[in-house]
Amino acid sequence: VDLTLLANLRITDPQRFFLTCVSGEAGAGRSSDPPLLLEKDDRIVRTFPPGQPLYLARNGSHQVTLRGFSKPSDLVGVFSCVGGAGARRTRVLYVHNSPGAHLFPDKVTHTVNKGDTAVLSAHVHKEKQTDVIWKNNGSYFNTLDWQEADDGRFQLQLQNVQPPSSGIYSATYLEASPLGSAFFRLIVRGCGAGRWGPGCVKDCPGCLHGGVCHDHDGECVCPPGFTGTRCEQACREGRFGQSCQEQCPGTAGCRGLTFCLPDPYGCSCGSGWRGSQCQEACAPGHFGADCRLQCQCQNGGTCDRFSGCVCPSGWHGVHCEKSDRIPQILSMATEVEFNIGTMPRINCAAAGNPFPVRGSMKLRKPDGTMLLSTKVIVEPDRTTAEFEVPSLTLGDSGFWECRVSTSGGQDSRRFKVNVKVPPVPLTAPRLLAKQSRQLVVSPLVSFSGDGPISSVRLHYRPQDSTIAWSAIVVDPSENVTLMNLKPKTGYNVRVQLSRPGEGGEGGWGPSALMTTDCPEPLLQPWLESWHVEGPDRLRVSWSLPSVPLSGDGFLLRLWDGARGQERRENISFPQARTALLTGLTPGTHYQLDVRLYHCTLLGPASPPAHVHLPPSGPPAPRHLHAQALSDSEIQLMWQHPEAPSGPISKYIVEIQVAGGSGDPQWMDVDRPEETSIIVRGLNASTRYLFRVRASVQGLGDWSNTVEEATLGNGLQSEGPVRESRAAEEGLDQ
């Protein structure tokens, strides 16, 4: 995993100090990948919490920086960066020692093989005449008397180390602050030197330039500044990362930077630098990370502290030990990638004297199978052999080797082959939006197999159809709009993903059923009339042009602007042209409009009508009762309504012959203080029904109905009249 944790040791001011974690993984930051995590790891080296919380700054998905340290003690301890997805999720650790500590490590990171002897050495920075305690992962391990210092150093020797011995070691003066400790990191490979894999039976590729062979996958973890399957190539000065793709920040290049890489490498200075602060250039004749490598150039080669020997014309090799007359395999990719099941052609070019010929070049697969070239191209300066590889399987992943052999000698070049599985969607595409004739689809789906995704092919066709699928190739990062579809139709939509290279097309993913919307209801209704049928009731009528109607019903919208409230009335009958709206608020100004709807789509609104509902009247008068006075007179008495909504302007009395079929008659009592009335002019021996209501701004509720009969033997009257102190008034009919 291409993951690097950088610490800038030149910055001693904690407030300016920062840690940066960089991922150079292909496809890093895919939306499905977990983000990079960079944090202080307090599980073993626990310091006081920082005065203020540390904060992360993300630069895209491939880089994260931790800042906000307020005091030197915030820096001491272990920091970790976690990156990669799934099985490739990897943690990189950095151990920071206080520059003012009592004890300081000669070397912080130690990588050793299983069974080796590890020596951790701490030199005295500020002497104390107390014992030195060694701890492993925070637990007591050993004690040294202060007088056991050898040449100002305390050493811990660990013999026959095993993987469980890995961890954080510390050396601390007794009764001194833990912040003054020397902190170390010991990494024990799971195999002996030069071995890897289950049972440690596989041979490491022979990592060059200080690269460390990974005990699980046999890959070389290259020091910063080197690349290639065996770390055989040096990057340009100031560059790092598995493909030399990253650049050290600032004008000083990689000076003062500590680089931490995935285990089993650990941490070191960048290529060309050494010292506890990584600020010292390599001494003459030395090069590489921590200047650990010696040039030993032959045949007039010169030593470059970043890349090693620079050979004069006619010579090559790590030490310029190889004559150009010995056959030499020319520039070849250190890593290639093919898709499973493909039959690629692999070329290998070589030069030398005598000239390599067809039979002198072979290709060795990881399982030991030798392939002979199927074609050879001879040019003045080289011979290129072409090998036709049988159908690749996942087992073909690993190190392949091109070999050339002539009477002048032999050469070989290893390169890594990665066999990839084309991606297959695990989920169906997702519907984002729909209209009557188009669907907006997100083609981004989770998938099995390998990325990166180079293209996405979307297939769609009507549900239950046997016609050929329509296909559209889309950008994987953008949503797709499928156009010119049929309204109200189900479409099956599925995705095919491809990765780069021949044979990179994966299989079809599951299909999703997506249905287009109804056609929009383009008709605009017109409001024709609106009638108030009571303080809380409104009768509305509308019209539509006599054209073909596509709609499911109407939506009546009443907007009460004063209260900021909207009421919607759904008329789910497309033939309706009138509606009675009830339960409205009396005394309210409403704006009313009507729209046609079809499925979930609304058509255009009618021009609005403005309606004012009258206020509601007062409650009913109480305790109405009637008493016959003669054969033509009945007295009515009542009490005022309880809590009328304003001053009562009048009472209205309703009179009706009991059991009669005629219309009722009404009388107004214009003096609201009066709560009784004598109704005159009634028929003798006749039963009457009476009720009364009050009026404020609007008419109130009717009282209870009372029944009373006039006395007998009177003459027939022309109709009832009320008693009045002024003049008699007729009835409203």
């Epitope: 383009l522 008709l523 017109w526 009339s529 042009p545 009618s606």
Partner: antibody, heavy 120, light 107 residues
Amino acid sequence: EVQLLESGGGLVQPGGSLRLSCAASGFTFSMYGMVWVRQAPGKGLEWVSVISPSGGNTGYADSVKGRFTISRDNSKNTLYLQMNSLRAEDTAVYYCARAPRGYSYGYYYWGQGTLVTVSS
Amino acid sequence: DIQMTQSPSSLSASVGDRVTITCRASQGIGHYLAWYQQKPGKVPKLLIYTASTLQSGVPSRFSGSGSGTDFTLTISSLQPEDVATYYCQQFNSYPHTFGQGTRLEIK
């Protein structure tokens, strides 16, 4: 052929009144909604008012609400705009246009316009 | 009321250029939008209705797209006779407001 002919424009003082007419021919007038749109000199189009085919349903822009009244006489195939309390900002060419029958998607038929100038 | 905002307010392009004018509604208006062309001293002419339907007789270089709040009028290859002011208008709810217009001229 559908024709719309506006008349009644002219010079009027602020606070004054004017009545515009739009004579329609070439189609069944009583089956179509009608609108007024105006355009101040050198400015953009502004929707003013609408009336339904029967005349029962009207709508106005906020800028003219309470001052202008739209009406129609289907027996005379004529659309009207009664403009009261006129202001300087009402100066514009006034167009009448036919709303498509039921489908509110655009005005295809327009009159040639009549100029109303409000100035003292 | 629904506000309609056109951009740009004016633009200059060469003959043969692809020209795009956008219109944004302050709230969703479905497909209920029309585009007009008005030449100096002339009556507005309907180009596009219901957002994307070309009015008969209008050259096919004119096209409309969009729904909801964002709409586009495109002239695929600008011609000298296309110099005019272009307006959008919404028909979703009253008042049926217009955009402020986009003046198009030839470079």
